[in-house]
């Protein structure tokens, strides 16, 4: 009996469209597959940024793969060819491997890079980006935005730059059509006359990245002797109710403070006769059913009660 | 609820200065752009300048040649607009106007400001 | 500067028929794969309102029947169905470079 063997893939390459992190890695079948006609090769692709301690392994029978990492860090791939075991009359066959690995040559000093980067979807309309500059650079360093997410055919600059002393600091986002609940890729780099500056890439989802705006129209309910409805609307704008949770900060009297966090628009408030003022506030933030993270909007108007009023049935500002 | 609360009707005699005010409220000032626009008696509208409130950069139309200054108040959430060396011509109603980036438009408005020039 | 010519000056409907007003661009007005193109309805004393930015998205609260088309310097607002209300001054107005300008106007009135 002849060991069966397969040669691993060729060309293997790791190859980057200019998508700022979104990568194709690809490969061609092996040589001497004549023998396999009739049978279905597959590859199995490992490949990680390079530090990472774990590999992301995939099985195929495309000769292409595309995925997002990391553009601060190396990036490392290997892959290698599978015969089935239906194709060999017994166990499954494995070539040996064939590696790529790929990076972008680093410009300048890690310090060079922009600062304190940070993005907030507002309302899940406006996306704002803002940094610092690097350390030490000069006035004449001037920093671009670049963004990408599936979808667009290639990388876009930033229409709007926040500005500092002439050096662009942040950028205000145009209308980002079909862009959530899909990785967005960022990269900031710069230019100086004095010396090369260090570029930055960030990835994101912008779901996750998103400050509401606070609920409005704050209002106030008797249920009966004992019980205080407290209600508010949910901002104008894209966001869905069913996406909100809301934090509650209530004072009765100056004194007793209570914080609750809800789901609905409403929240029952146990009372007693003796209550002679009550005042309220709301914010609010994307909830775990539409984003894996988010960030608290601000505080709403504070709504107020005082007097003997509190026994009517509707209280309004 | 956004807003934007523009100061009151000014009448001016020719070659004076007037400076309009605009208190933001109802949503985070820094974050948009804010627009001073102007539209004379039964005429279109003219766009004057704009200014950043974030970092206080200002773009402004050339056609004012220097008359016109833009400023902000950050901590205040006000704009101001000040038309200097007035003439008849600019009797019109001025307005400011916020707008997040060029690529969105202007999408709310103060209630304008009546600047009346006249001897 | 950029100069937007609007036509017609003044479009005569009634009620329920469709109205298209139009736009026109001394040179383009898109850049990054935008078109940096608005469009504002204005009543007698009253701001203007936002009703289309970049060219054919709908602002906020405006209803499904006004929408805009276009790119480079052509560029349409359609009013689909016409209401009472929509009978005022229509102004499109480009964000691409400064200063900012805005067209002449058409006005809608009623026929």
């Known amino acids: 009996d002849t060991e069966i063997k397969v040669n691993p893939p060729q060309d293997f390459e790791i190859v980057d469209p200019g998508y700022l992190g979104y990568l194709y890695l690809q490969w061609q079948p092996p040589l001497s597959l004549d023998h396999f006609k009739e049978c279905t090769v597959e590859y199995e692709l490992k490949y990680r940024n390079i530090g990472s301690e774990t590999w992301k392994t995939i099985i195929t029978k495309n000769l292409h793969y595309k995925d997002g990492f990391d553009l601060n860090k190396g990036i490392e791939a290997k892959i290698h060819t599978l015969l089935p075991w239906q194709c060999t009359n017994g166990s499954e066959v494995q070539s040996s491997w064939a590696e790529t690995t790929y990076w972008i040559s680093p410009q300048g000093i890690p310090e060079t890079k922009v600062q304190d980067m940070d993005c907030v979807y507002y309302n899940w309309q406006y996306l704002l980006c803002s940094w610092k500059p690097g350390i030490g650079v000069l006035l004449d360093t001037n920093y671009n935005l670049f963004y990408w997410y599936e979808g667009l055919d290639h990388a876009l600059q930033c229409v709007d730059y926040i500005k500092a002393d002439g050096q662009n600091i942040g950028c205000r986002f145009p209308y980002l059509e079909a862009s959530d609940y899909k990785d967005f890729y960022i990269c900031v780099n710069g230019s100086s006359e004095n010396k090369p500056i260090r570029s930055s890439y960030f990835t994101f989802q912008l779901q996750n990245i998103v400050k509401p705006l606070p609920p409005v129209y704050l209002t106030f309910t008797r249920e009966s002797s004992c019980e205080i409805k407290l209600k508010w609307s949910i901002p104008l704008g894209p966001i869905p109710a069913r996406c909100f949770d809301y934090e509650i900060e209530i004072r009765e009297d100056d004194t007793t403070l209570v914080t609750a966090t809800v789901e609905n628009e409403t929240y029952t408030l146990k009372t007693t006769n003796e209550t002679r003022q009550l005042c309220f506030v709301v914010r609010s933030k994307v909830n775990i059913y539409c984003s894996d993270d988010g960030i608290w909007s601000e505080w709403s108007d504070k709504q107020c009660w005082e007097g003997e009023d509190l026994s009517k049935k509707t209280l309004l500002r | 609820q956004v807003q934007l609360v523009q100061s009151g009707a000014e009448v001016k005699k020719p070659g004076a200065s007037v400076k309009v005010s605009c208190k933001a409220s109802g949503y985070t000032f820094s974050n948009y752009l804010m627009n001073w626009v102007r539209q004379a008696p039964g005429q279109g509208l003219e766009w004057m300048g704009r200014?950043?409130?974030?970092?206080?950069?200002?773009d402004y139309n050339q056609n004012f040649k220097d008359r016109v200054t833009i400023t902000r108040d950050k901590s205040a959430s006000t704009a101001y607009m000040e038309l200097s060396s007035l003439r008849s011509e600019d009797t019109a109603v001025y307005y400011c106007?916020?707008?997040?980036?060029?690529?969105?438009?202007?999408?709310?408005w103060g209630q304008g400001t009546s600047v009346t020039v006249s001897s | 500067e950029i100069v937007l010519t609007q036509s017609p000056a003044t479009l005569s409907l009634s009620p329920g028929e469709r109205a298209t007003l139009s736009c026109r661009a001394s040179?383009?007005?898109?850049?990054?794969?935008?078109?940096?193109m608005n469009w504002y309805q204005q009543k007698p004393g009253q701001a203007p309102r936002l009703l289309i930015y970049a060219a054919s998205r709908q602002g906020s609260g405006i209803p499904d029947r006004f929408s805009g088309s276009g790119s480079g310097t052509d560029f349409t607002l359609t009013i689909s169905r016409l209401e009472p209300e929509d009978f005022a001054v229509y102004f499109c107005q480009q964000s691409k470079e400064v200063p900012w300008t805005f067209g002449g106007g058409t006005k809608l009135e009623i026929k």
């Open positions: 200014i950043d409130p974030y970092d206080g950069d200002i």
């Open positions: 106007a916020r707008g997040y980036g060029t690529a969105y438009g202007v999408d709310y």
């Open positions: 040179e383009s007005v898109d850049n990054y794969g935008i078109s940096f």
